[in-house]
């Protein structure tokens, strides 16, 4: 007789990350009689909602259920039918809404509110929309990685998933970087961890792990950009501000309110004579990298060692993963090979930043301009806060690894936030059953 | 399976009042944002009001000062309290998850001398 396909015991499990720039829907699906093993999770899907973060819909709430409506239906469409009601959805957002709530705390529920809303009509499980620490963020990232590596299982592999893994049970660190802010999370090597803002203690798999984390709010990619324009708009003799972090024949024009909207920028804040400026991109890497080192605050550090800003920072140990727009902006500059040295992704920065921007603009056609334009300053920013922000040197290079996705999975936080909210990361190491993954019955 | 039973309904005179339950099952009641919608005769649904899983909320122009909505998320519970009420307001009541989502069998609200 035929043997028949026994219908598939799986779960699914649903996480919405609302970033500063945009939001993305992760589908996960699991064997439901293997929850607690490691790295049995695994990405089926992610949707891109069109249109901006959660933030920016401050003023017009009433458009956040159309604006979630695409990616939920479209996860409608992958789970299967039985199984919507017992598929759970969490939105956690990140610090694009912390910003807002730090200017509002009345407009940051509203917002919430309203998404709570419009999820609570979907036939999944909702299980709450809400702002996560930015330590979260970095240890849900540092959760995520580790999973996806296999670095919590005990069963030590005799083949190697990913290019990087090495067969041993180090775990990786994490390196983060959004729009809004940036993660640093890593278990230090036998240092005490001297601010206890920064400390971690996780059981996981019968293992203890003293992690270190902190996340730099308004240390993200675009809120750095805001930071750096504030600040140097503070000392343009004019309208014009000649930019070396654009590319030289890039112009644009902006909104003095625009620049002092965000919180980030307060500290540079002051009464300008005009309500427009010009940038004018002049395309110097060396100016740039000197510009955005006046971001990081190095002559105070009340610790041991800082990273910046006063911030303390362990030594750099290990492997780490650098993943969200440190692969993104890194990829697209075709910098995520493990061969190219520090040096060399020096020297092509400063190839790329010095060409004009109608040469770049032909290169790229198929790319929007917003986000063309800005590759320079991303690039660079990078480089500025790897290598001045938190210590890696040439040498060190090598142990960052540029990573998208882990076995078909997107390298974030958002995996270890549903790992962690539905139980599925065990404090002790599960019992083997009887019947192994290798029995045949 | 998402299961909301509504309750509470029945005939009252203007002016009178009444207390609407919904009892709710098969999902995490306490994360959501719910809601009562009510059909008139003959009308389409219209929302009425909402609250969300931390309590706030919000109703429509026309029950503003008369309903209150609130929820016991120990008691898997929605209610509606209605005073002042109208002959405007006669309606078939529903809970809903969500303000669209799945919603219950209705429990039928009768307002006239």
């Known amino acids: 007789t035929q043997n028949k396909a026994l219908p598939e015991n799986v779960k699914y499990g649903i996480v919405l990350d609302a970033g500063s720039s945009h939001t993305s829907l992760y589908i996960y699906k699991w064997p439901a009689e293997k929850e607690n093993d490691t790295g049995v999770v695994h990405q089926v899907e992610e949707c891109r909602v069109k249109g901006p973060g959660i933030s920016k819909f401050v003023q017009k709430v009433n458009e956040i259920g159309i604006y979630l409506t695409d990616c939920m239906e479209r996860a409608r469409e992958v789970i299967p039918r039985s199984q919507h009601q017992e598929t759970p959805v969490y939105l956690g957002a990140t610090a694009g809404m912390r910003l807002l709530r730090m200017e509002s705390e009345e407009l940051a529920d509203r917002v919430l509110d309203v998404v709570e809303r419009s999820l609570s009509n979907y036939p999944f499980d909702f299980q709450g929309a809400r702002i996560i620490t930015g330590q979260e963020e970095g240890a849900y990232g540092w959760i995520t990685i580790n999973y996806l590596l296999g670095k919590f299982s005990q069963k030590t592999r005799w083949f190697s998933i990913v290019p990087y893994e090495t067969n041993n049970q180090e775990t990786f660190g994490a390196l983060d970087l959004g729009g809004a802010s940036t993660q640093v999370t890593f278990v230090p090597q036998n240092q005490t961890i001297e601010s206890p803002d920064n400390a971690l203690q996780f059981r996981l798999y019968g293992k203890d792990y003293n992690v270190y984390t902190h996340s730099f709010l308004c240390y993200g990619k675009d809120q750095a950009l805001w930071q750096k324009l504030a600040k140097d708009i503070q000392v343009a003799s004019n309208e014009i501000l000649r930019d070396p972090c654009f590319h030289p024949g890039y112009k644009k024009v902006v909104n003095v309110s625009d620049l002092y909207k965000t919180p980030c920028t307060k500290r540079f804040e002051m009464t300008l004579p005009f309500q427009q400026f010009e940038i004018q991109g002049i395309g110097n890497y060396q100016q740039c990298h000197q510009s955005i080192l006046e971001l990081f605050n190095t002559s105070y550090c009340p610790y041991s060692q800082c990273a910046f800003n006063g911030i303390f920072l362990p030594p750099l140990q290990g492997d780490f993963g650098a993943f969200s727009a440190f692969y993104f902006v890194m990829k697209f500059l075709n910098l995520t090979s493990e061969k190219v040295s520090q040096e060399k992704v020096t020297e092509m920065m400063k190839k790329f930043c010095a060409q004009p921007w109608e040469e770049i603009k032909t290169s790229y056609a198929g790319v929007k301009e917003k986000y063309l334009s800005e590759y320079c300053f991303s690039g660079t920013y990078i480089l500025s806060l790897l290598l001045q922000g938190y210590h890696f040197t040439a040498d060190s290079w090598e142990h960052i690894h540029f990573i998208g996705k882990i076995q078909g999975s997107d390298a974030g936080w958002t995996l270890g936030y549903m790992l962690n909210l539905t139980n599925m990361i065990p404090a002790e190491q599960p019992l083997s059953t009887p019947l192994s993954h290798s029995t045949y019955v | 399976q998402v299961k909301l039973q509504e309750s509470g309904g029945g005939w009252v005179q203007p002016g009178g009042s009444l207390r609407l339950s919904c009892a709710a099952s098969g999902f995490t009641f306490r994360t959501h944002f719910m809601s009562w919608v009510r059909q008139a005769p003959g009308q389409g649904l219209e929302w009425v009001s909402g609250?969300?899983?931390?309590?706030?909320?919000s109703y429509v122009d026309s029950v503003k000062g008369r309903f209150t909505i609130s929820r016991d998320n120990a008691a898997n519970t929605l209610y509606l309290q209605m005073n002042s009420l109208k002959p405007e307001d006669t309606a078939v009541y529903f809970c809903t998850k969500g303000d669209s989502g799945a919603r219950g069998q209705g429990t039928q609200v009768t307002v006239s001398s």
């Open positions: 609250i969300t899983s931390g309590g706030r909320t």
